[in-house]
């Protein structure tokens, strides 16, 4: 016999992301010992959320928290019992209670203390569920991905840790009713309201962010039917072939559809919209979207928003990723410059119908938005943000990195569990447990 | 308001084309939705056979893909099916049905719901010598 | 292609009385977040009626008895306070996936 070194025992934390279409419960693990270390927390499982976003329980916010318990459970089970107690449990919520919050701030109360109450029943030691700002839900998806690529420090092989040369990379975060850019800047904003400092590991970090409200996917494609329904009669982003029946009062029901609300609508009435497969109209339609008529500063993105120009690297995650995907996967088309993703989008856009759906077999309904969700995304990255070729080809679009699904759920976590200390760690001694 | 309505022959030999005519009134067949056919085998469920367009495309019950075709004939407002080599497991009620895809939403989401919401009443087709 | 189960194939419910039907999907009919299944109802001798779209979105001009409910693989329809003119065979329907599919059906007798 010969003694055999235990392993350190595992740390677990649990973050629901409650996303505006739906909610996703992600529990995370680390070795007890290695708390202050980087790259240390990794994913230990996830679990989806059947049914839609708790923003869509506004009228029955009990269903809201009834429909977590599936996923609950099922951290009852992954989390080793006797870790139970000490596990911390987060609930954030982002742009979609951020909506209903502007519109019904009672029902969005109401939500967040029904889900309160079924959380508190649980064991783990729950720290609370809240809405997001923008600014976090950008930074924290950022400090996700930098902690996951280690670039915020790491293990040197002569025993140090050092601060890695090629330095951070910048975070795009497209969701449902928003999207966020998050990159490290040299410079101070000249608004203050996008600029973050942050302490990690002892270095410090200018970070510039922006969350535009109302341009993530979903909130997008129902304002891009809104704008097909005022000024075509048909719709130049869906595929021909393409027949719909839209009730009004549901295109228009989002504040972010407000502003092109008729003034006097039927909200029952229900109008037949068909599709065109039109990429040039369909460009046009979303273009509609930016405003690059005034900026108080001395650059902007869009809409008068302050943002200095892209620098570096940067990975596209959630909704980035999924469009992209479909474009490379699904249609089996190149994305690797800027050119090739808008020929891409008028590729898709081109396609009638019957040709997409014989593309990508099975009836995906959604299908029909891939058009508009393509050119969106060329648009937002080229024109919006300002990427040109050059920046562009520093882009990475990412689902996962380390196992681990890229989003503001971890970044959360660290933060809120102080697992990334401020100062830096000193000279440590590692300990092989192969 | 839309209305359908099925004809054609009662009885068809076995081996032979099931031919079904479906009329459609208040509504241009070639201005939208998806012109179904779906049929009811005695005391069973419900089965999709197909649809044509109103941009003339087809899809087809991957089941039945080999032996059916619906066509349509716009000057008249109709719309057909042919069902080749029948035999008695083709008897049934055979409906006509215009679809769409609903527009709904579900949370913040928008999402398009394939439904079909005007029927014909049926017609009974028995398959036999 | 998706398989759909009812049960229980006939129910029988006194007027007044709560009735549930429910549809079971051999794969989840959810996407994205969204679940693609409706519901109808056939009287006898009458073409099918649409009655729920997206599990749980009521159909114009369909009385608010009539609710849905459910997600993934498992779909809920319920009747609140039954009355004699429910008397019907129900099928739920997904449009998750091609070909569109039907369950075999619910009829509900009243007593």
């Known amino acids: 016999t010969r003694d055999v070194r235990e392993p350190p025992a595992l740390k677990y934390g649990i973050v629901l992301d409650a996303g505006s279409s739906h909610t996703s419960m992600f529990i995370y693990k680390w070795p007890a010992d290695k708390e202050n270390d980087t790259g240390i927390v990794g994913q230990h499982s996830s679990c989806d959320v059947p049914g839609g976003g708790i923003s869509s329980y506004a009228d029955n916010p009990s269903g809201a928290s009834q429909s977590l318990v599936g996923c609950l459970e099922q951290a009852l089970q992954d989390v080793p019992k006797e870790r139970h107690a000490g596990t911390p449990l987060y609930l954030g919520a982002t742009a979609g209670m951020r909506l209903l919050n502007l519109t019904n701030p009672e029902a969005s109360t109401s939500v967040l203390m029904a889900v309160t109450h079924t959380l508190t029943q649980y064991p783990f030691d729950f720290r609370g569920a809240r809405i997001l700002s923008g600014q976090e839900e950008g930074v924290f998806g950022w400090v996700t991905a930098n902690y996951l690529l280690e670039n915020f420090i790491k293990y040197g092989w002569v025993g140090r840790w050092f601060r890695p040369r090629k330095g951070t990379l910048g975070a795009m975060d497209l969701g449902g009713a928003s999207t966020q850019i998050t990159f490290e800047t040299t410079s101070p904003a000249e608004d203050r309201a996008s600029e973050v400092q942050l302490h990690l590991y002892g270095q410090h970090y200018r970070v510039y962010t922006h969350s535009f409200l109302c341009y993530g996917r979903d909130q997008v494609l129902q304002r891009l039917l809104a704008s097909a329904l005022q000024t075509h009669g048909f719709h130049p982003c869906w595929p021909r072939g393409f027949s719909t029946q839209v009730l009004l009062g549901d295109v228009y029901q989002s504040p972010c559809t407000m502003a092109q609300r008729p003034q006097n609508f039927n909200s029952s009435a229900r109008v037949s919209l068909s599709g065109s497969s039109d990429p040039h109209l369909c460009r046009d339609l979303v273009s509609g979207l930016f405003s690059f008529s005034s900026c108080p500063f001395s650059r902007c993105s869009f809409n008068g928003v302050f943002q200095p120009p892209v620098a570096g690297n940067f990975v596209a995650f959630s909704a980035f990723f999924y469009t992209v995907d479909f474009l490379r996967t699904s249609m089996g088309l190149p994305v690797a410059t800027l050119q090739q993703l808008e020929a891409a989008a008028v590729n898709v856009c081109n396609q009638t119908w019957a040709q997409l759906q014989a593309r990508v077999p099975g009836q995906r309904a959604r299908l029909a938005d891939y058009c508009a969700g393509a050119m969106f995304v060329q648009q937002l990255l080229s024109r919006g943000y300002g990427f040109d070729e050059r920046a562009f080809g520093g882009v990475i679009f990412q689902k996962k990195a380390a196992d681990t699904a890229v989003g503001w759920a971890l970044g959360y976590m660290l933060n809120l569990t102080n697992l990334i200390p401020a100062d830096p760690p000193g000279l440590r001694k590692g300990t092989d447990f192969s | 308001q839309i209305q359908l309505q099925e004809s054609g022959p009662g009885l068809v030999k076995p081996s032979q084309t099931l031919s079904l005519t479906c009329t459609v009134s208040g509504y241009s067949i070639t201005s939208g939705y998806y012109w179904n056919w779906i049929r009811q085998h005695p005391g069973k469920g419900l089965e999709w056979i197909g649809y044509i367009s109103y941009d003339a495309d087809n899809n087809y019950n991957p089941s039945l893909k080999n032996r059916v075709t619906i066509s349509r004939d716009t000057s008249k407002n109709q719309f057909s099916l042919k069902l080749s080599s029948v035999t008695a497991a083709d008897t049934a009620v055979y409906y006509c049905?215009?679809?769409?895809?609903?527009?709904?939403?579900?949370?913040?989401?928008?999402?398009?719901?394939?439904?079909?919401?005007?029927w014909g009443q049926g017609t009974t087709v028995t398959v036999s010598s | 292609e998706t398989v759909l189960t009812q049960s229980p194939a006939t129910l029988s419910v006194s007027p007044g009385e709560r009735a549930t039907i429910s549809c079971k999907a051999s794969?989840?009919?959810?996407?994205?977040?969204?679940?693609?299944m409706n519901w109808y109802q056939q009287k006898p001798g009458q073409a099918p009626r649409l009655l729920i779209y997206a599990a749980s979105n009521l159909e114009s001009g369909i009385p608010a008895r009539f609710s849905g409910s459910g997600s993934g693989t498992d779909f809920t329809l319920t009747i609140s306070s039954v009355e004699p003119e429910d008397a019907a065979t129900y099928y739920c329907?997904?449009?998750?996936?091609?070909?569109?599919?039907f369950g075999g059906g619910t009829k509900l007798e009243i007593k």
């Open positions: 329907q997904q449009s998750n996936e091609d070909p569109p599919t």
């Open positions: 049905a215009g679809g769409y895809y609903r527009y709904g939403l579900g949370s913040y989401r928008g999402s398009y719901y394939y439904v079909m919401d005007y």
């Open positions: 794969q989840s009919v959810d996407y994205d977040g969204n679940s693609y």
